[in-house]
Each structure stands twice: as C-alpha cells, then as structure tokens.
Amino acid sequence: MAVTACQGLGFVVSLIGIAGIIAATCMDQWSTQDLYNNPVTAVFNYQGLWRSCVRESSGFTECRGYFTLLGLPAMLQAVRALMIVGIVLGAIGLLVSIFALKCIRIGSMEDSAKANMTLTSGIMFIVSGLCAIAGVSVFANMLVTNFWMSTANMYTGMGGMVQTVQTRYTFGAALFVGWVAGGLTLIGGVMMCIACRGLAPEETNYKAVSYHASGHSVAYKPGGFKASTGFGSNTKNKKIYDGGARTEDEVQSYPSKHDYV
C-alpha cells in the first residue's frame, strides 16, 4: 500500500512541479523594475525569457518579443535552454510514470518493468527539477550582478547637469515559481525512486528446486530471505503445496505480495 501511495504522491508532486516549470518559463515577470524608494511608478518595466513589457500607470501595457536570437545575452539563451530541457524531460517523465503507476494495469506488464519505468521517470523528474532550479538560479545570479553594477552607476552625470536614472531590475515572481516548481519536481522524482525500490520483485529469479519428502511433495524456492525494503510486509519463503514439483514459470499465477498492496 505504501509503495502505491509513494508512487502516486511522487507522480502528483512532479505533475504540479512540471506545470509550475512550464508556467515560470512562460511568465513575463522574471525580472521586475526595482522600486527601491519609489513604490509608485508611472512606468513599470518587467522582463521574461521571451519578451519585455512596460506597464504605464494609465493601465496600458505593451510587450515586445525578443525577435533576435543572436543578439541576446548568452546567459539568457542558457536559461531558456535549461528551462526547455527541464520541461521536455519532465513531460517524458510524466508519460513514462503514467504507465509505471501501480494503480494502472497495462496488459501483463510485470512489476520489474514497472519498477524500471518508475526509476526512469524518477531520474527524469530529478534532472528536470535540477534543470529548472539551475536555470532560475543562473538568471537570479545575472540579476544580482546587474543590480549592483547599475547601483554603482545609479546616476551617470551628463555635463554635470543632466541625470540619467538607470532602471534597476530585481527578482520577479517567475523566479520564485521556478524555484518552488523545480523543488517539487525534484521531490517528486526522489519519491518515484523510493517507490521503485518497493516495486522491484524481492525474489531472485532462480528455477525452483524440487525436494521430494516422504509424506508429500513440497517445492521450496530459495532466495526468499531478502532484506526488507520497508514497504509492505517482508516476504517469507513461499511454499507451494501442490502435490508435485513445479518450475518458477509454472507458478506465475500464484499471488505475490505486490498484488495485495
């Protein structure tokens, strides 16, 4: 039961995280004009990964896309790349994890296959989350650097008379959305990896060896004493009271502990 819960929760958390990463990537408020000592401004600037916007106090908002590719800073391109890689990996991870969910039956997919898919999606979520966190952090670092540079040149004198006030930018809402979303995706990935351990079959796939007792036939299957994963009850040695010896392949239809989770 705990395995399914962990897997399901991991999926949901990752789903929310990836939705957040997509939202952050599309948002315009990656950097917003720093209002420092001027909380009310007639012209408010904010920028995203794809366009920059200006909101006037009149209520009119104008956004302009970055129509150049080569003219953009390398750091911005890197952030875009990281966020897109994060989204793509996350989307593939979600697709894989849907088929890996224990609560969804697809043909006669074995638990080992589901475990592998769960692990794969978990790793994808972890990398996706890390990409998002890295992207947002690179952008935040760029902002901090530019903020202090523009603070140093806050007023650049022109002929000693005219002042040019430089627009300083600070963290926008998208950064916080990105950090939280990346963290959630990462947590969801870790949960999927943990769930994978509980999904993996606990017996080594050896052929059962038959021991013919004098009273009645009992097939003993060795390798049953494996360390408990902590999910569900520990599997004891399975005894198959069947009157005759059988191989592992012949006893597949017998219930395993995973059917009762």
Epitope: S52, S57, V162
Partner: antibody, heavy 118, light 113 residues
Framework: QVQLQQPGTELVKPGASVKLSCKAS????????MHWVKQRPGHGLEWIGM????????NYNEKFRSKATLTVDKSSSTAYMQLSSLTSEDSAVYYC???????????WGQGTSVTVSS | DIVMTQSPSSLTVTAGERVTMSCKSS????????????LTWYHQKPGQPPKLLIY???TRESGVPDRFTGSGSGTDFTLTIRSVQAEDLAVYYC?????????FGSGTKLEIK
C-alpha cells in the same frame, strides 16, 4: 463621447475648505486614473495627484499632500478633490483629467475656478 | 522632481511660418523597456483647458493636424509647427510623464502677427 464636467466657480473664505467635483461620462469610469491639475496665472500647470476609481489607490505630489484629498464615488462616476485650510495661494483653476497612452492627459474638464477671498 | 525647462518663453510669428520650440528635462525621460520617451506636448488656447497634441515625444494624438511634429530623445525635445495657422495661437506646454510627480514646463506662448 468622453466628458468631464466641473462646476465653473467656487468662492470660499480663507481657512475654509472646498470640495470640487468632476463628473465623468462617455467611458468606463473605473478603468482610468483620474488626475487633478492646478493652474495659477504666472505659475503654469502643477500636478496635484491621482486616484484610481476602482481600487481607490491615490498618489499625491508631496507639495499638495496636506492640502488636497482625493476621493471618488463609483455609483455616480464622480471624482472629488477636497482642498483644506485655504489661503490666497490656493486661488487657481483646478482641472480634472483622465490619462491614457503614454500617461498623457487626453481629456480635461473645463476647470473650476476657486477664489479665496474674505 | 524632474524639472522641465521650455524656451523661448514667447514667440511671435507670421501665418505660414515654420516654428520650433524647445523643452529640456533635468533627467532622461527615455524608458529602455519599450524604447519610448515619456514626454507629452499640450497647447492651451485662451479660456480653455489644455489639449493633448503629442505623447511619447512624437506620437500625434488622433485629430491633431500633421503640421505638428514632435522630436527628440532623452532630455532634449522639440515641437515643430510646419506652417503656423491663426488657430495655433496658444501656450504650448511640455510635460514629464515618466516619473512622479508629473511636472510641466513653464510654457511657450505663441503669438501670431
């Protein structure tokens, strides 16, 4: 069409207060900031402040913060400016105005002439 | 506060002449976010409220004749009337729309001979 209607004149005594009105019509009143501007002969135009009829947010020119109080009545699409502790310096024409693209004042009321005299 | 300085304070011209008037601001009115200058021109005829002519330094308000042209960037701006008409008799004001408090120039009075 857009109209901002203001009463023509107000005659008040020194030390008293006056509440000027500006009735808006021809547009969605709650969508635009309403600004107030003072004009005194020989002193040009001075921006007093602004109010948003929907959020009631205000922003004042520090010079007029203790002099003017801006309010609105959404139901009647009317903006008000109360001027307190009036002196001869407050004798002027007061305009209400709406802002649009570029924060430009695209429509102006006809102005209310305030005369402070004993 | 941004100080707006207009020159000349008055101009006397004959109808049909080309007129230019200047407006300087103490701080740049250029916004890098949208590459626009937040400077507005108004004119005020005797006994009337000011009327919007040009915003964003050079964008004409609808209904304003094309003889009115705004130019300039940063701190130096110019209003040009290509061929002055008798009805252009007015006081011309420039205004900072970039930061609060909004401030106006002292005006240029245009008189027709």
């Amino acid at each position: 069409q857009v109209q901002l209607q203001q009463p023509g004149t107000e005659l008040v005594k020194p030390g008293a207060s006056v509440k000027l009105s500006c009735k808006a019509s021809g547009y969605t009143f709650t969508n635009y900031w309403m600004h107030w501007v003072k004009q005194r002969p020989g002193h040009g135009l001075e921006w007093i402040g602004m109010i948003h009829p929907n959020s009631y947010s205000t922003n004042y020119n520090e010079k007029f913060r203790s002099k003017a109080t801006l309010t609105v009545d959404k139901s009647s699409s009317t903006a008000y400016m109360q001027l307190s502790s009036l002196t001869s310096e407050d004798s002027a024409v007061y305009y209400c105005t709406r802002i649009y693209y570029g924060n430009a004042m695209d429509y102006w009321g006809q102005g209310t002439s305030v005369t402070v005299s004993s | 506060d941004i100080v707006m300085t207009q020159s000349p304070s008055s101009l006397t011209v004959t109808a049909g002449e080309r007129v230019t008037m200047s407006c300087k601001s103490s701080q740049s009115l250029f916004n890098s976010g949208n590459q626009k200058n937040y400077l507005t021109w108004y004119h005020q005829k005797p006994g009337q409220p000011p009327k919007l002519l040009i915003y964003w330094a050079f964008t004409r308000e609808s209904g304003v004749p094309d003889r009115f042209t705004g130019s300039g960037s940063g701190t130096d701006f110019t209003l040009t009337i290509r061929s002055v008409q008798a009805e252009d008799l007015a006081v011309y004001y420039c205004q900072n729309d970039y930061s609060y408090p909004f401030t106006f120039g002292s005006g240029t009075k245009l008189e027709i001979k």
